[in-house]
């Protein structure tokens, strides 16, 4: 006879997920090397010709802040977008009635440090829809799950998280 | 030179009106999120009301909600404080003081301010 | 509503460290800003973000902010400093509001 918790009675458990704390960033390393989102490819404008590589999210289960009022934040490499809608599920498994809300996406106003990967659509803000801070640590965590390449809890306002070129082998690779 | 200029302020029976303002200049005001922050004599400072920079939000304290409004004029780089059924305890100097911050996803502090214009509430 | 308490008063002396203190109920969540008012002054702001300091404020005042408790240290504190400090605190759900003041006094 199986004793419980052996063989094929074994139940699988779910995996305990640790919130990140604050200034913390998984992988643990500059944003913009290779083991995590890769390096900085240039700022995208809307007259660039790389500007087609941005896809607009429509995601319903998604809210985007959009304070430009020009849908900038919609638009975001493939990759982001993919990364980004499977956390907005998570999201709202975590914390039902809660959606994943974006802040910032792709930007073509220059608010953010230079060579940020937010200008190339490859980074995003995000909060919870409550803007419950204490959710935040979690939330982080969720991203990191979700898949993207880097994720930073960079501000007591919102988690940062960036993927990593399409064109890039790891990406392609799924790595 | 980044200025803010308070006026309005006066003495006023209790019950009655006044209407603060504040004129703006050297800086894109319609940029900051705007404040009204008070002093009575000898007390501590006391926020009472914010105008975001979106326009999308505002905000009041409670000791002043459904008696104070605020609101601003961006082609006039002005700001104002309706204030009605004023009472004793609204007797205080009133700042005016920006901040770069949204008031939802960022707030960077106050880091300008008027001199201040002072409300006396008394009969 | 939410409370920020501040001591009252605070002494140092002439080129030590004075640490200025600000406690409120899950204070690490938001973000602390330190104002500093002189007599028959408007506030100026010293402190914003927890930790930063807006340009023209000397090195001497640095901030920190964990737990329950956020402080305002001033190293090297100078004559000049003496004045009332008013901590403020951010969060995106609830309004803004400030410490009762902390007199700083140097001997």
């Known amino acids: 006879i199986i004793g419980p918790g052996r063989g094929f009675g074994k139940r699988r458990h779910p995996k305990k997920l640790t919130p990140l704390a604050y200034k913390q960033f998984i992988p643990n390393v500059a944003e913009k090397t290779l083991g995590a989102s890769g390096r900085y490819e240039g700022k995208i404008t809307r007259n660039s010709e790389r500007f087609k590589e941005l896809t607009p999210n429509y995601n319903p289960d998604i809210i985007f802040k959009d304070e430009e009022n020009t849908g900038a934040d919609r638009l975001m490499t493939q990759r982001c977008k993919d990364k980004l809608n499977a956390l907005a599920i998570s999201v709202m498994n975590q914390w039902p009635g809660v959606k994943l809300r974006v802040t910032e996406g792709w930007d073509e106003d220059g608010h953010h440090s230079e060579e940020s990967l937010h200008y190339e659509g490859r980074a995003v803000d995000i909060t919870t829809s409550d803007r419950d801070r204490s959710k935040y640590g979690m939330l982080a965590r969720l991203a990191v799950e979700a898949g993207f390449d880097w994720v930073y809890y960079e501000s007591k306002a919102h988690i940062h998280c960036s993927v990593k070129a399409e064109n890039s082998v790891a990406a392609k690779s799924g790595g | 030179e980044v200025q803010l200029v308070e006026s309005g302020g006066g003495l006023v029976k209790p019950g009655g009106s006044l209407r603060l303002s504040c004129a703006a200049s050297?800086?894109?005001?319609?940029?900051?999120?705007m404040n009204w922050v008070r002093q009575a004599p000898g007390k501590g400072l006391e926020w009472v009301s914010s105008?975001?920079?979106?326009?999308?939000?505002?905000y009041y304290a409670d000791s002043v909600k459904g008696r104070f409004t605020i609101s601003r004029d961006n082609a006039k780089n002005s700001l104002y404080l309706q204030m009605n059924s004023l009472r004793a305890e609204d007797t205080a100097v009133y700042y005016c003081?920006?901040?770069?911050?949204?008031?939802?996803?960022?707030?960077?502090?106050?880091?300008?301010w008027g001199q201040g214009t002072t409300v006396t509430v008394s009969s | 509503s939410y409370e920020l308490t501040q001591p009252p008063s605070v002494s140092v002396s002439p080129g030590q460290t004075a640490s200025i203190t600000c406690s409120g109920d899950?204070?690490?969540?938001?973000?602390i800003c330190w104002y500093q008012q002189k007599p028959g002054q408007s506030p100026v702001l010293v402190i914003y973000?927890?930790?930063k300091r807006p340009s023209g404020i000397p090195e001497r005042f640095s901030g920190s902010n964990s737990g329950n408790t956020a402080t305002l240290t001033i190293s090297g504190t100078q004559a000049m400093d003496e004045a009332d400090y008013y901590c403020?605190?951010?969060?995106?759900?609830?309004?803004?509001?400030f410490g009762g003041g902390t007199k700083l006094t140097v001997l």
């Open positions: 003081a920006r901040d770069r911050g949204d008031y939802v996803d960022y707030y960077y502090g106050m880091d300008v």
């Open positions: 050297g800086f894109t005001f319609s940029s900051y999120s």
């Open positions: 105008f975001s920079s979106s326009s999308s939000y505002i």
């Open positions: 899950k204070l690490d969540y938001k973000y």
């Open positions: 973000q927890d930790i």
């Open positions: 403020q605190a951010w969060d995106s759900n609830t309004p803004l509001v």
